[in-house]
Protein backbone atom coordinates (compact mmCIF):
# COMPACT_ATOMS: atom_id res chain seq x y z
CA UNK A 1 0.00 0.00 0.00
CA UNK A 2 1.60 3.20 -0.84
CA UNK A 3 0.70 6.08 1.78
CA UNK A 4 -1.43 8.92 0.52
CA UNK A 5 1.03 11.69 -0.32
CA UNK A 6 0.39 15.60 -2.05
CA UNK A 7 1.80 15.90 -5.71
CA UNK A 8 4.89 18.03 -5.89
CA UNK A 9 4.28 21.22 -7.65
CA UNK A 10 4.17 20.86 -11.71
CA UNK A 11 4.19 17.23 -11.28
CA UNK A 12 0.31 16.33 -11.93
CA UNK A 13 0.77 14.17 -15.04
CA UNK A 14 -1.48 15.53 -17.68
CA UNK A 15 -1.43 12.65 -20.00
CA UNK A 16 0.25 9.08 -19.62
CA UNK A 17 3.52 9.12 -21.32
CA UNK A 18 7.18 8.21 -21.29
CA UNK A 19 8.48 10.99 -18.51
CA UNK A 20 6.34 9.11 -15.95
CA UNK A 21 9.28 6.82 -16.30
CA UNK A 22 10.58 8.86 -14.09
CA UNK A 23 8.11 9.09 -11.17
CA UNK A 24 8.87 7.36 -8.04
CA UNK A 25 6.41 4.94 -6.62
CA UNK A 26 4.59 7.66 -4.33
CA UNK A 27 4.71 10.46 -6.94
CA UNK A 28 3.07 8.09 -9.34
CA UNK A 29 0.09 7.33 -6.76
CA UNK A 30 -0.44 11.09 -5.69
CA UNK A 31 0.23 12.43 -9.43
CA UNK A 32 -1.65 10.22 -11.78
CA UNK A 33 -5.03 10.10 -12.45
CA UNK A 34 -7.16 6.63 -12.30
CA UNK A 35 -9.28 8.04 -14.53
CA UNK A 36 -6.73 9.53 -16.55
CA UNK A 37 -4.84 6.21 -16.60
CA UNK A 38 -8.37 4.01 -17.62
CA UNK A 39 -8.95 6.62 -20.62
CA UNK A 40 -5.35 6.08 -21.86
CA UNK A 41 -4.26 2.25 -21.18
CA UNK A 42 -3.20 2.01 -24.67
CA UNK A 43 -0.34 3.84 -23.80
CA UNK A 44 1.03 1.83 -20.87
CA UNK A 45 2.16 -0.99 -22.38
CA UNK A 46 4.61 1.09 -25.11
CA UNK A 47 5.90 2.74 -21.99
CA UNK A 48 8.85 0.77 -20.43
CA UNK A 49 8.15 0.86 -16.56
CA UNK A 50 9.14 -1.06 -13.91
CA UNK A 51 7.15 -3.95 -12.11
CA UNK A 52 7.24 -1.83 -8.78
CA UNK A 53 5.56 1.42 -11.15
CA UNK A 54 3.10 -1.42 -12.44
CA UNK A 55 2.11 -1.69 -8.71
CA UNK A 56 1.13 1.57 -8.36
CA UNK A 57 -1.20 1.68 -11.27
CA UNK A 58 -2.83 -1.78 -10.61
CA UNK A 59 -3.54 -0.35 -7.51
CA UNK A 60 -5.13 2.89 -8.91
CA UNK A 61 -7.22 0.81 -11.27
CA UNK A 62 -8.44 -0.98 -8.20
CA UNK A 63 -9.71 1.94 -6.42
CA UNK A 64 -11.12 2.83 -9.67
CA UNK A 65 -13.03 -0.44 -10.61
CA UNK A 66 -13.81 -3.01 -7.41
CA UNK A 67 -16.32 -4.85 -9.44
CA UNK A 68 -13.66 -5.71 -11.87
CA UNK A 69 -12.16 -3.61 -14.74
CA UNK A 70 -14.05 -3.08 -17.86
CA UNK A 71 -12.94 -4.92 -21.29
CA UNK A 72 -11.80 -1.44 -22.80
CA UNK A 73 -8.90 -1.54 -19.46
CA UNK A 74 -8.52 -5.03 -20.06
CA UNK A 75 -7.49 -5.35 -23.40
CA UNK A 76 -4.78 -2.43 -23.08
CA UNK A 77 -3.04 -4.24 -19.97
CA UNK A 78 -0.32 -5.28 -21.56
CA UNK A 79 2.36 -5.97 -18.89
CA UNK A 80 -0.03 -4.86 -16.53
CA UNK A 81 -1.35 -8.28 -16.70
CA UNK A 82 1.17 -9.85 -14.93
CA UNK A 83 0.73 -7.84 -11.80
CA UNK A 84 -3.18 -9.41 -12.01
CA UNK A 85 -4.05 -12.14 -9.67
CA UNK A 86 -6.56 -15.34 -10.61
CA UNK A 87 -8.90 -13.50 -7.97
CA UNK A 88 -8.60 -9.57 -10.23
CA UNK A 89 -9.07 -12.04 -13.54
CA UNK A 90 -12.63 -13.94 -12.04
CA UNK A 91 -13.72 -10.66 -11.78
CA UNK A 92 -14.04 -9.92 -15.11
CA UNK A 93 -16.32 -10.22 -18.19
CA UNK A 94 -13.60 -10.72 -21.34
CA UNK A 95 -16.31 -11.41 -24.36
CA UNK A 96 -13.31 -10.39 -26.96
CA UNK A 97 -10.92 -12.62 -28.60
CA UNK A 98 -8.86 -9.95 -29.29
CA UNK A 99 -8.43 -8.62 -25.86
CA UNK A 100 -8.02 -12.28 -25.53
CA UNK A 101 -4.96 -12.56 -27.54
CA UNK A 102 -3.78 -9.52 -26.45
CA UNK A 103 -3.41 -10.70 -22.86
CA UNK A 104 -1.72 -14.49 -24.42
CA UNK A 105 0.82 -12.07 -26.04
CA UNK A 106 1.80 -10.86 -22.73
CA UNK A 107 2.59 -14.23 -21.04
CA UNK A 108 3.96 -15.40 -24.80
CA UNK A 109 6.76 -17.85 -24.25
CA UNK A 110 6.38 -19.03 -20.83
CA UNK A 111 4.48 -21.50 -19.21
CA UNK A 112 0.73 -21.42 -19.02
CA UNK A 113 0.40 -19.39 -15.46
CA UNK A 114 -2.33 -19.18 -13.17
CA UNK A 115 -3.76 -16.12 -14.37
CA UNK A 116 -3.64 -17.46 -18.27
CA UNK A 117 -5.86 -20.53 -17.23
CA UNK A 118 -8.17 -18.02 -15.15
CA UNK A 119 -8.13 -15.84 -17.81
CA UNK A 120 -9.30 -18.47 -20.45
CA UNK A 121 -11.55 -20.59 -18.41
CA UNK A 122 -13.91 -17.30 -18.06
CA UNK A 123 -13.60 -16.28 -21.58
CA UNK A 124 -14.08 -20.07 -22.33
CA UNK A 125 -17.30 -20.31 -19.82
CA UNK A 126 -18.35 -16.52 -21.32
CA UNK A 127 -18.89 -17.73 -24.77
CA UNK A 128 -20.54 -21.19 -23.98
CA UNK A 129 -18.32 -23.42 -26.15
CA UNK A 130 -14.70 -23.46 -27.46
CA UNK A 131 -14.82 -22.37 -30.86
CA UNK A 132 -13.14 -22.73 -33.98
CA UNK A 133 -11.19 -19.05 -33.63
CA UNK A 134 -10.60 -19.63 -30.25
CA UNK A 135 -9.34 -22.78 -29.87
CA UNK A 136 -7.17 -21.93 -32.67
CA UNK A 137 -5.74 -19.25 -31.02
CA UNK A 138 -5.30 -21.18 -27.60
CA UNK A 139 -3.51 -23.72 -29.40
CA UNK A 140 -1.29 -21.10 -31.43
CA UNK A 141 -0.10 -19.84 -27.78
CA UNK A 142 0.07 -23.05 -25.90
CA UNK A 143 0.05 -26.22 -28.11
CA UNK A 144 -0.98 -28.48 -24.79
CA UNK A 145 -4.06 -26.41 -24.07
CA UNK A 146 -6.41 -29.17 -25.42
CA UNK A 147 -4.65 -31.99 -23.45
CA UNK A 148 -5.10 -29.79 -19.51
CA UNK A 149 -8.71 -30.03 -20.15
CA UNK A 150 -10.84 -32.34 -18.66
CA UNK A 151 -13.12 -34.82 -20.64
CA UNK A 152 -16.10 -33.16 -19.28
CA UNK A 153 -14.66 -29.44 -20.60
CA UNK A 154 -13.86 -31.63 -23.80
CA UNK A 155 -17.06 -32.52 -24.64
CA UNK A 156 -18.13 -28.70 -25.33
CA UNK A 157 -15.63 -28.83 -28.23
CA UNK A 158 -17.99 -28.35 -31.18
CA UNK A 159 -16.69 -30.94 -34.39
CA UNK A 160 -16.37 -27.85 -35.92
CA UNK A 161 -13.17 -27.03 -33.90
CA UNK A 162 -11.04 -29.84 -34.64
CA UNK A 163 -10.38 -28.26 -37.74
CA UNK A 164 -8.12 -26.37 -35.61
CA UNK A 165 -5.91 -28.88 -33.54
CA UNK A 166 -2.65 -29.73 -35.14
CA UNK A 167 -0.90 -33.05 -33.84
CA UNK A 168 1.85 -31.70 -31.78
CA UNK A 169 -1.33 -30.19 -30.12
CA UNK A 170 -2.66 -33.75 -28.62
CA UNK A 171 1.03 -34.82 -27.43
CA UNK A 172 -0.10 -35.04 -23.83
CA UNK A 173 -3.31 -36.14 -23.94
CA UNK A 174 -4.27 -39.11 -22.20
CA UNK A 175 -6.43 -41.67 -23.92
CA UNK A 176 -9.36 -40.19 -21.68
CA UNK A 177 -9.37 -37.48 -23.55
CA UNK A 178 -8.79 -39.10 -26.60
CA UNK A 179 -12.00 -41.23 -25.91
CA UNK A 180 -13.63 -37.57 -26.49
CA UNK A 181 -11.80 -36.08 -29.27
CA UNK A 182 -11.76 -39.33 -31.38
CA UNK A 183 -16.03 -39.44 -32.24
CA UNK A 184 -15.85 -34.88 -33.00
CA UNK A 185 -12.94 -35.65 -35.22
CA UNK A 186 -14.51 -38.48 -36.80
CA UNK A 187 -17.52 -36.38 -37.68
CA UNK A 188 -15.46 -33.46 -38.39
CA UNK A 189 -13.95 -35.23 -40.95
CA UNK A 190 -16.06 -37.73 -42.40
CA UNK A 191 -16.34 -36.34 -46.11
CA UNK A 192 -12.59 -36.47 -46.55
CA UNK A 193 -11.77 -39.36 -49.00
CA UNK A 194 -9.41 -42.17 -47.41
CA UNK A 195 -5.86 -41.03 -47.66
CA UNK A 196 -6.82 -37.56 -46.65
CA UNK A 197 -9.06 -38.73 -44.01
CA UNK A 198 -6.57 -40.30 -42.42
CA UNK A 199 -3.86 -37.82 -42.54
CA UNK A 200 -6.74 -35.90 -40.07
CA UNK A 201 -7.67 -38.95 -38.08
CA UNK A 202 -4.57 -40.28 -37.23
CA UNK A 203 -3.96 -37.75 -34.37
CA UNK A 204 -7.00 -38.51 -32.78
CA UNK A 205 -6.74 -42.80 -33.13
CA UNK A 206 -5.67 -43.07 -28.87
CA UNK A 207 -9.40 -42.87 -28.77
CA UNK A 208 -10.55 -45.00 -31.79
CA UNK A 209 -12.97 -48.24 -31.02
CA UNK A 210 -12.18 -51.52 -32.84
CA UNK A 211 -14.67 -51.39 -34.91
CA UNK A 212 -12.80 -48.27 -36.65
CA UNK A 213 -9.44 -49.80 -36.93
CA UNK A 214 -10.99 -53.01 -38.86
CA UNK A 215 -12.86 -50.30 -41.11
CA UNK A 216 -9.18 -48.57 -42.08
CA UNK A 217 -7.42 -51.70 -42.21
CA UNK A 218 -9.35 -52.17 -45.38
CA UNK A 219 -7.96 -48.74 -46.43
CA UNK A 220 -4.44 -49.24 -47.09
CA UNK A 221 -3.31 -46.61 -44.70
CA UNK A 222 0.28 -47.97 -43.40
CA UNK A 223 -0.19 -46.96 -39.95
CA UNK A 224 3.37 -45.94 -38.11
CA UNK A 225 4.36 -47.93 -35.46
CA UNK A 226 4.10 -44.53 -33.35
CA UNK A 227 0.72 -43.94 -34.46
CA UNK A 228 -0.12 -47.74 -33.45
CA UNK A 229 1.63 -47.73 -30.12
CA UNK A 230 -0.73 -44.94 -28.78
CA UNK A 231 -4.07 -47.16 -29.68
CA UNK A 232 -6.35 -48.13 -26.92
CA UNK A 233 -5.13 -51.73 -25.95
CA UNK A 234 -9.07 -52.80 -25.59
CA UNK A 235 -9.63 -51.82 -29.42
CA UNK A 236 -6.17 -53.54 -30.34
CA UNK A 237 -6.71 -57.02 -28.63
CA UNK A 238 -9.89 -57.83 -30.88
CA UNK A 239 -7.49 -57.37 -33.94
CA UNK A 240 -6.95 -60.24 -36.17
CA UNK A 241 -2.96 -61.05 -37.49
CA UNK A 242 -4.42 -60.21 -41.16
CA UNK A 243 -6.14 -56.42 -40.20
CA UNK A 244 -2.79 -55.89 -38.26
CA UNK A 245 -0.95 -56.50 -41.00
CA UNK A 246 -2.86 -54.99 -43.76
CA UNK A 247 -3.63 -51.56 -40.66
CA UNK A 248 0.51 -51.28 -40.96
CA UNK A 249 1.61 -52.43 -44.50
CA UNK A 250 5.10 -51.95 -44.29
CA UNK A 251 5.50 -50.67 -40.88
CA UNK A 252 4.59 -54.15 -39.85
CA UNK A 253 8.36 -55.55 -38.96
CA UNK A 254 8.56 -52.84 -36.15
CA UNK A 255 6.16 -55.45 -34.19
CA UNK A 256 9.59 -57.12 -33.63
CA UNK A 257 10.85 -53.87 -31.80
CA UNK A 258 7.61 -53.62 -29.45
CA UNK A 259 6.97 -56.77 -28.73
CA UNK A 260 7.46 -56.53 -24.96
CA UNK A 261 4.98 -53.26 -24.72
CA UNK A 262 1.50 -52.46 -24.69
CA UNK A 263 -0.22 -52.49 -26.75
CA UNK A 264 1.27 -55.32 -28.70
CA UNK A 265 2.54 -57.80 -26.04
CA UNK A 266 -1.00 -58.05 -24.89
CA UNK A 267 -2.39 -58.75 -28.71
CA UNK A 268 0.34 -60.89 -28.95
CA UNK A 269 -1.10 -62.97 -26.49
CA UNK A 270 -4.44 -62.87 -27.71
CA UNK A 271 -3.63 -64.27 -31.01
CA UNK A 272 -2.64 -67.74 -32.33
CA UNK A 273 1.36 -68.28 -32.81
CA UNK A 274 0.89 -69.67 -36.32
CA UNK A 275 -0.82 -66.83 -37.06
CA UNK A 276 1.71 -64.79 -35.50
CA UNK A 277 4.63 -66.80 -37.89
CA UNK A 278 3.01 -66.26 -41.16
CA UNK A 279 4.27 -62.44 -40.43
CA UNK A 280 7.53 -64.12 -40.26
CA UNK A 281 9.30 -61.24 -37.46
CA UNK A 282 9.81 -64.22 -35.00
CA UNK A 283 7.11 -62.64 -32.53
CA UNK A 284 6.80 -65.08 -29.76
CA UNK A 285 3.97 -65.86 -27.06
CA UNK A 286 0.86 -66.70 -28.96
CA UNK A 287 -1.33 -68.98 -28.02
CA UNK A 288 0.57 -72.56 -29.06
CA UNK A 289 -1.20 -74.88 -31.81
CA UNK A 290 -3.98 -76.98 -31.12
CA UNK A 291 -4.90 -74.99 -27.56
CA UNK A 292 -8.67 -73.92 -27.51
CA UNK A 293 -9.26 -70.24 -27.09
CA UNK A 294 -12.86 -69.82 -24.80
CA UNK A 295 -13.87 -66.27 -25.34
CA UNK A 296 -15.76 -65.62 -21.59
CA UNK A 297 -16.80 -62.05 -22.29
CA UNK A 298 -18.96 -63.20 -25.30
CA UNK A 299 -20.36 -66.42 -23.32
CA UNK A 300 -21.34 -64.17 -20.74
CA UNK A 301 -22.78 -61.87 -23.42
CA UNK A 302 -24.59 -64.62 -24.57
CA UNK A 303 -26.19 -65.94 -21.44
CA UNK B 1 13.35 12.91 -41.54
CA UNK B 2 13.93 12.03 -37.94
CA UNK B 3 17.13 12.77 -37.12
CA UNK B 4 19.72 14.12 -34.31
CA UNK B 5 22.82 16.40 -35.18
CA UNK B 6 25.34 17.07 -32.89
CA UNK B 7 28.03 19.68 -32.59
CA UNK B 8 31.61 19.13 -34.20
CA UNK B 9 34.85 18.10 -32.52
CA UNK B 10 36.36 19.04 -29.55
CA UNK B 11 39.98 19.29 -28.33
CA UNK B 12 40.31 20.27 -25.30
CA UNK B 13 43.16 20.78 -22.34
CA UNK B 14 42.35 18.51 -19.14
CA UNK B 15 40.88 21.20 -16.82
CA UNK B 16 38.94 23.12 -18.91
CA UNK B 17 34.96 23.12 -19.49
CA UNK B 18 32.74 21.60 -22.30
CA UNK B 19 29.52 21.68 -23.34
CA UNK B 20 28.14 19.65 -26.95
CA UNK B 21 24.63 19.65 -28.27
CA UNK B 22 22.92 17.51 -30.04
CA UNK B 23 20.06 19.28 -31.86
CA UNK B 24 16.52 17.20 -32.53
CA UNK B 25 14.59 17.63 -35.86
CA UNK B 26 11.53 15.59 -37.45
CA UNK B 27 9.79 15.10 -34.24
CA UNK B 28 8.44 16.23 -31.32
CA UNK B 29 11.29 16.51 -29.22
CA UNK B 30 9.69 16.77 -26.03
CA UNK B 31 7.89 13.38 -26.02
CA UNK B 32 10.74 11.37 -25.97
CA UNK B 33 14.12 11.19 -23.96
CA UNK B 34 17.63 11.60 -25.29
CA UNK B 35 20.17 9.32 -23.77
CA UNK B 36 24.31 10.43 -23.78
CA UNK B 37 26.30 7.35 -24.91
CA UNK B 38 30.42 7.48 -24.41
CA UNK B 39 32.20 5.42 -26.52
CA UNK B 40 35.80 5.54 -25.44
CA UNK B 41 38.77 4.15 -28.15
CA UNK B 42 38.86 0.66 -29.38
CA UNK B 43 35.52 0.09 -26.07
CA UNK B 44 32.07 -0.35 -25.95
CA UNK B 45 28.49 1.52 -25.34
CA UNK B 46 28.62 3.17 -21.85
CA UNK B 47 25.33 4.58 -20.92
CA UNK B 48 26.02 8.02 -18.97
CA UNK B 49 22.26 9.57 -18.33
CA UNK B 50 18.54 10.34 -19.99
CA UNK B 51 16.70 13.64 -20.18
CA UNK B 52 12.86 13.83 -20.70
CA UNK B 53 13.17 17.53 -22.53
CA UNK B 54 9.31 18.41 -21.59
CA UNK B 55 10.15 18.17 -18.15
CA UNK B 56 13.59 18.36 -17.84
CA UNK B 57 13.77 15.26 -16.08
CA UNK B 58 17.25 13.03 -15.38
CA UNK B 59 18.34 10.19 -14.24
CA UNK B 60 22.28 9.45 -14.52
CA UNK B 61 24.57 6.20 -14.77
CA UNK B 62 26.36 5.97 -11.06
CA UNK B 63 29.64 5.94 -13.04
CA UNK B 64 28.83 9.51 -14.71
CA UNK B 65 26.99 11.18 -11.85
CA UNK B 66 28.80 14.14 -10.54
CA UNK B 67 30.49 13.88 -13.62
CA UNK B 68 28.78 15.46 -16.35
CA UNK B 69 25.64 17.29 -16.36
CA UNK B 70 22.86 16.65 -19.30
CA UNK B 71 20.46 19.51 -19.72
CA UNK B 72 18.49 20.44 -22.92
CA UNK B 73 16.57 23.71 -23.95
CA UNK B 74 13.05 22.52 -25.56
CA UNK B 75 12.66 25.72 -27.16
CA UNK B 76 15.35 24.84 -30.10
CA UNK B 77 14.97 20.74 -29.64
CA UNK B 78 18.47 20.87 -28.37
CA UNK B 79 19.88 18.56 -25.34
CA UNK B 80 23.13 18.87 -23.94
CA UNK B 81 26.32 17.24 -22.39
CA UNK B 82 28.94 19.54 -20.25
CA UNK B 83 31.82 19.02 -18.49
CA UNK B 84 33.29 21.64 -15.79
CA UNK B 85 36.86 19.96 -15.82
CA UNK B 86 38.06 17.55 -18.40
CA UNK B 87 40.43 15.03 -17.76
CA UNK B 88 42.37 12.94 -20.30
CA UNK B 89 40.23 9.86 -19.78
CA UNK B 90 37.36 11.70 -21.20
CA UNK B 91 38.56 11.42 -24.09
CA UNK B 92 35.92 9.94 -26.55
CA UNK B 93 33.40 9.59 -28.81
CA UNK B 94 29.96 10.83 -27.70
CA UNK B 95 26.85 9.99 -28.92
CA UNK B 96 22.91 11.66 -28.18
CA UNK B 97 20.13 9.19 -28.87
CA UNK B 98 16.41 9.43 -28.91
CA UNK B 99 14.78 6.77 -26.45
CA UNK B 100 11.42 5.28 -26.51
CA UNK B 101 10.29 2.23 -24.84
CA UNK B 102 12.92 1.42 -23.29
CA UNK B 103 15.51 1.22 -26.99
CA UNK B 104 17.48 4.09 -28.38
CA UNK B 105 15.40 4.19 -32.04
CA UNK B 106 17.63 6.98 -33.46
CA UNK B 107 21.29 8.18 -32.71
CA UNK B 108 23.66 11.64 -33.76
CA UNK B 109 26.43 11.08 -35.49
CA UNK B 110 28.81 11.19 -32.84
CA UNK B 111 31.15 14.26 -31.03
CA UNK B 112 34.14 13.11 -30.73
CA UNK B 113 36.25 15.07 -27.39
CA UNK B 114 39.65 14.48 -27.29
CA UNK B 115 41.49 15.71 -23.56
CA UNK B 116 44.96 16.30 -24.32
CA UNK B 117 47.80 18.61 -22.73
CA UNK C 1 31.54 -2.92 -14.94
CA UNK C 2 29.27 -4.69 -17.34
CA UNK C 3 26.12 -6.13 -15.99
CA UNK C 4 25.61 -8.00 -19.60
CA UNK C 5 27.89 -10.85 -20.88
CA UNK C 6 28.24 -11.17 -24.47
CA UNK C 7 31.28 -13.26 -26.22
CA UNK C 8 33.56 -10.96 -27.43
CA UNK C 9 33.68 -12.13 -31.14
CA UNK C 10 32.16 -14.89 -33.14
CA UNK C 11 32.48 -15.71 -36.53
CA UNK C 12 30.83 -17.55 -39.62
CA UNK C 13 30.71 -17.86 -43.22
CA UNK C 14 28.19 -16.19 -46.00
CA UNK C 15 24.99 -17.69 -46.19
CA UNK C 16 25.49 -19.42 -42.96
CA UNK C 17 23.60 -18.56 -39.26
CA UNK C 18 24.94 -17.26 -36.00
CA UNK C 19 23.60 -16.48 -32.55
CA UNK C 20 25.29 -13.92 -29.81
CA UNK C 21 24.08 -14.34 -26.76
CA UNK C 22 23.51 -11.46 -23.79
CA UNK C 23 23.38 -12.63 -20.52
CA UNK C 24 22.33 -10.49 -17.59
CA UNK C 25 20.36 -11.50 -14.13
CA UNK C 26 16.76 -12.32 -13.05
CA UNK C 27 16.14 -8.66 -12.43
CA UNK C 28 17.06 -7.28 -15.85
CA UNK C 29 16.66 -9.53 -18.74
CA UNK C 30 15.51 -12.06 -16.98
CA UNK C 31 12.17 -10.24 -15.81
CA UNK C 32 11.50 -7.57 -18.01
CA UNK C 33 11.20 -7.39 -22.10
CA UNK C 34 13.06 -4.25 -23.08
CA UNK C 35 15.98 -5.91 -24.32
CA UNK C 36 17.37 -4.23 -27.61
CA UNK C 37 20.47 -5.02 -30.12
CA UNK C 38 22.34 -2.47 -32.05
CA UNK C 39 24.67 -2.72 -34.90
CA UNK C 40 27.94 -0.57 -35.31
CA UNK C 41 29.68 -0.66 -38.47
CA UNK C 42 33.50 1.19 -38.09
CA UNK C 43 33.70 5.04 -37.59
CA UNK C 44 29.69 5.10 -37.89
CA UNK C 45 26.84 5.83 -35.05
CA UNK C 46 25.13 2.15 -33.62
CA UNK C 47 22.22 1.37 -35.41
CA UNK C 48 18.62 -0.45 -33.53
CA UNK C 49 18.43 -3.56 -34.82
CA UNK C 50 15.71 -5.33 -32.55
CA UNK C 51 13.65 -4.17 -29.72
CA UNK C 52 12.02 -5.40 -26.74
CA UNK C 53 13.02 -8.82 -27.44
CA UNK C 54 11.87 -9.95 -30.52
CA UNK C 55 10.63 -6.92 -32.72
CA UNK C 56 12.27 -5.23 -35.49
CA UNK C 57 12.11 -1.99 -36.66
CA UNK C 58 11.03 -1.12 -40.10
CA UNK C 59 13.49 -1.13 -42.54
CA UNK C 60 15.77 -4.20 -40.80
CA UNK C 61 16.38 -6.92 -42.53
CA UNK C 62 14.51 -10.35 -41.34
CA UNK C 63 17.79 -11.95 -41.48
CA UNK C 64 17.93 -10.35 -38.59
CA UNK C 65 15.70 -11.92 -35.08
CA UNK C 66 16.12 -11.98 -31.37
CA UNK C 67 14.79 -13.98 -28.45
CA UNK C 68 15.48 -14.68 -25.18
CA UNK C 69 15.16 -17.34 -22.34
CA UNK C 70 15.63 -16.98 -19.36
CA UNK C 71 18.02 -14.44 -18.02
CA UNK C 72 20.14 -14.69 -21.87
CA UNK C 73 19.20 -13.11 -25.04
CA UNK C 74 20.05 -13.80 -28.19
CA UNK C 75 20.64 -12.46 -31.51
CA UNK C 76 20.57 -14.43 -34.61
CA UNK C 77 21.34 -13.33 -38.23
CA UNK C 78 20.92 -15.86 -41.00
CA UNK C 79 22.29 -16.11 -44.31
CA UNK C 80 25.15 -14.37 -43.75
CA UNK C 81 26.34 -11.33 -45.70
CA UNK C 82 29.65 -9.53 -46.02
CA UNK C 83 28.02 -6.04 -44.66
CA UNK C 84 26.84 -8.10 -41.72
CA UNK C 85 30.41 -7.88 -40.11
CA UNK C 86 30.29 -5.02 -37.37
CA UNK C 87 29.95 -4.95 -33.67
CA UNK C 88 26.65 -6.00 -31.75
CA UNK C 89 25.53 -4.58 -28.52
CA UNK C 90 22.85 -5.85 -26.69
CA UNK C 91 21.20 -3.04 -24.09
CA UNK C 92 18.51 -3.68 -21.39
CA UNK C 93 16.48 -1.91 -19.70
CA UNK C 94 15.37 -1.11 -16.29
CA UNK C 95 13.46 2.32 -15.87
CA UNK C 96 14.56 4.60 -15.81
CA UNK C 97 18.29 3.18 -16.16
CA UNK C 98 20.10 1.47 -18.76
CA UNK C 99 22.77 -0.95 -19.64
CA UNK C 100 25.35 -1.97 -22.55
CA UNK C 101 26.75 -5.52 -23.22
CA UNK C 102 30.25 -5.39 -23.78
CA UNK C 103 29.86 -6.19 -27.62
CA UNK C 104 30.63 -8.66 -29.76
CA UNK C 105 32.81 -8.40 -32.95
CA UNK C 106 30.92 -10.26 -35.85
CA UNK C 107 33.41 -11.63 -38.36
CA UNK C 108 31.95 -12.59 -42.01
CA UNK C 109 35.12 -15.55 -42.74
Known amino acids: EVEKTACPSGKKAREIDESLIFYKKWELEACVDAALLATQMDRVNAIPFTYEQLDVLKHKLDELYPQGYPESVIQHLGYLFLKMSPEDIRKWNVTSLETLKALLEVNKGHEMSPQVATLIDRFVKGRGQLDKDTLDTLTAFYPGYLCSLSPEELSSVPPSSIWAVRPQDLDTCDPRQLDVLYPKARLAFQNMNGSEYFVKIQSFLGGAPTEDLKALSQQNVSMDLATFMKLRTDAVLPLTVAEVQKLLGPHVEGLKAEERHRPVRDWILRQRQDDLDTLGLGLQGGIPNGYLVLDLSMQEALS | QVQLVQSGAEVKKPGESLKISCKGS????????IGWVRQAPGKGLEWMGFIYPDKSYTNYSPSFQGQVTISADKSISTAYLQWSSLKASDTAMYYC??????????WGQGTLVTVSS | DIALTQPASVSGSPGQSITISCTGTSSDVGDYNYVSWYQQHPGKAPKLMIYRVDNRPSGVSNRFSGSKSGNTASLTISGLQAEDEADYYCQSWVGPSTVFGGGTKLTVL
Open chain 2, 26 to 33: GYSFTTYW
Open chain 2, 97 to 106: ARGLGGSFDV
